[in-house]
């Protein structure tokens, strides 16, 4: 039988999503945060 709760808040329960990681420091060293000079 199909036991997984499938429609809680419209999304399957038990399915782990995988977001893309965010790197706010962009092209700088991970310890620094600087936006390109054109801004």
């Amino acid at each position: 039988s199909y036991s997984m709760e499938h429609f809680r808040w419209g999304k399957p329960v038990g399915k782990k999503r995988r977001p893309v990681k965010v790197y706010p420091n962009g092209a700088e060293d991970e310890s620094a945060e600087a936006f390109p000079l054109e801004f």
């Epitope: 893309v20 990681k21 790197y23 092209a27």
Partner: antibody, heavy 115, light 110 residues
Amino acid sequence: QQQLVESGGGLVQPGGSLRLSCAASGFTVSDTYDMCWVRQAPGKGLEWIGCIDTGSGDTYYPTSAKGRFTISRDNSKNTLYLQMNSLRAEDTAVYYCAKGVSSLWGQGTLVTVSS
Amino acid sequence: DIQMTQSPSTLSASVGDRVTITCQASEDIESDLAWYQQKPGKAPKLLIYGASTLKSGVPSRFSGSGSGTEYTLTISSLQPDDFATYYCQTYYDMADDGASFGGGTKVEIK
């Protein structure tokens, strides 16, 4: 300063294959990063092609890219790859590699599919 | 699959104008949304992530808001350097086609 440099673009005939490279400097690809490929057809918008978790090697693709496109990495060369097969005219685009969601993108490499 | 619908596709404005760009997701993306600016012949630059977090160094005239499926990028007072194309991107779920871009909004001089 972290940098990404793509190469390998050029003219290819329909049905052909091409492998693009993305050389990273200023950071080590073998650390766990999400590295992605995005393309942009001439005069059009951005299209996500897929990403690789450089730690595990797990890859993720949109439905449109599954089957024809393969992302890989060579940790010893600190380089990311995009293998493209069965190329079509509509694959003509500038191909960018990017470090996850960030401002760290390469300059792009143009792929032209034409006979 | 998550679709991102961005509007308008083109926006004509003048320096000093308040500009608003919207992005609608086909499902709840829980604020996993980024905004990029792109100029001709250049790679995109990240402006905002987490729907509303301004990247360090980005001018405060840029702001992002929204939740659920509706998101907005606002430029409070348009500057000459801001004429460019803007894209939203969700990064909600790579495993389920959930890293797609909106179609883009070109902000041009009126």
